[in-house]
């Protein structure tokens, strides 16, 4: 299930029209496309250009992150007169051109979405041959990937003075709320760290001091679901060691 966000001010699409007396390039992309992790998404992109009936070699490119300089995730090339755009690059084999660049359509399908795919994408077309021109969407389309929570790490670590602390890290979009439960705890939100820079979908919660032996459970929840994982703390009394 893929949702395309409607931007009322631009009437569904970001339309970038650039014209001068001799030329007119425009590119149409939606501001945002939403899809769930594991599913596929389509990034629509259509364009117009000033070179009437252009039939020469062309290259279609999609890049991520930033326009002009971001890394390419997809590239294909069509020979003169050909409607087939031969894929030269498809990052991890998950990107596939749906549109026909000869018909001014660069729409791209992204398979097996992961949270790491949540970023902005920019379509680009290059004409090569007698006509020598190129154009790239400058605003791009934001791919918003949603995901139910998943606990990626849960652990007990030693802390000063023979004490122990527990850490729980989960990912999800929207970022999940984390709660700890365990002996003498009830339910505790326990020092939730905000998502780390560059890891926008990761949330960590810490239990700074584990005072009782037993089972400690971390629960991660967002609007798409919940997940839980447990660790066990058992200290050898009279010794400084612990078993988890």
């Amino acid at each position: 299930f893929v949702r395309t966000k409607i931007d009322t001010t631009e009437n569904l699409l970001n339309t970038e029209v650039h014209s001068s007396p001799a030329q007119r390039w425009s590119m149409q992309v939606p501001p945002e496309v939403s899809a769930e992790a594991g599913d596929a998404a389509v990034l629509p992109c259509t364009f117009t250009h000033p070179h009437r009936h252009y039939d020469g070699p062309l290259t279609a490119i999609w890049r991520a992150g930033e326009p002009y300089a971001g890394p390419q995730v997809f590239r294909c090339a069509a020979a003169r007169g050909s409607e087939l755009c031969q894929t030269a690059l498809s990052l991890h084999g998950r990107f596939r051109l749906l549109g026909n660049p000869r018909r001014n359509d660069l729409s791209l399908r992204v398979e097996r979405l992961a949270l790491a795919d949540d970023r902005r994408y920019f379509c680009r077309v290059e004409f090569a041959g007698d006509v020598h021109d190129r154009y790239e969407s400058r605003h791009g389309v934001r791919l918003h990937v949603t995901a139910a929570p998943r606990i990626v790490n849960i652990s007990v670590l030693p802390s000063p003075a023979h004490a122990f602390r527990a850490l729980c890290t989960a990912e999800g979009e929207p970022p999940p709320a984390l709660a700890w439960s365990g002996p003498a705890l009830g339910n505790s939100l326990a020092a939730v760290r905000s998502p780390r820079e560059g890891h926008g979908h990761l949330v960590t919660a810490e239990l700074p001091a584990l005072t009782h032996d037993g089972r400690y459970t971390c629960t991660a929840a967002n609007s798409l679901g919940r997940s839980e994982a447990s660790v066990y703390l058992f200290r050898f009394h009279g010794a400084s060691g612990a078993s988890t």
Epitope: H18, W25, P57, Y68, A69, A77, H132, Y135, R138
Partner: antibody
Framework: EVQLVESDGGLVQPGRSLKLSCAAS????????LAWVRQAPTKGLEWVAS????????YYRDSVKGRFTISRDNAKSTLSLQMDSLRSEDTATYYC???????????WGQGTLVTVSS | DIVMTQTPLSLSVTPGASASISCRSS???????????VFWYLQKPGRSPRLLIY???NLASGVPDRFRGSGSETDFTLKISRVEAEDVGIYYC?????????FGSGTKLEIK
Amino acid sequence: EVQLVESDGGLVQPGRSLKLSCAASGFTFSDYYLAWVRQAPTKGLEWVASVSYQGITNYYRDSVKGRFTISRDNAKSTLSLQMDSLRSEDTATYYCARQDWEGGFAYWGQGTLVTVSS
Amino acid sequence: DIVMTQTPLSLSVTPGASASISCRSSKSLLHSPGLTYVFWYLQKPGRSPRLLIYRVSNLASGVPDRFRGSGSETDFTLKISRVEAEDVGIYYCGQLLENPFTFGSGTKLEIK
């Protein structure tokens, strides 16, 4: 770190051939156009040729068309310039450069001197 | 072909002073709003050229903000404030709008 390293040029007689190569590292080679730019002794910069991502499309300045051939090997991250029917006016330092379109000739090799003389 | 005309051919500047180099193209280098294919390069003595400024006014990586590019359409300027000894060399403007890609003839900057 982006690096472009040209092979040695040398002295060649008019009408003869020479092949230059350029080894690239530090970036995704096939994601960029590449170019050769030359500079005659005590003169300015002159673009010679460019090659597209997969080597499908090549561009040349008029004075070298039909004599020079630019090519690339993406598997080996190398750029080449085959120069045939060399003329004295081709004497120059030849630089390979990464052509970033909206980013200009963003990175340059150290250059290699080609002297065409009898 | 697009002709890039640079002025002056050379200039001699006192350290700490400002320097200005002009570049005029024979055709507008504006492709579309916000996208003008003009670039500035510096070639220090005995070295390869180095990109200084891309798309009129954007500073390339590692270039100090004493360098500033400006202009539009056909008229472009590179301004160097607080010139230092390490700024000596030949400055070139260039265009990547149309094949053949062309450069200006260069401006030699010397320190007084």
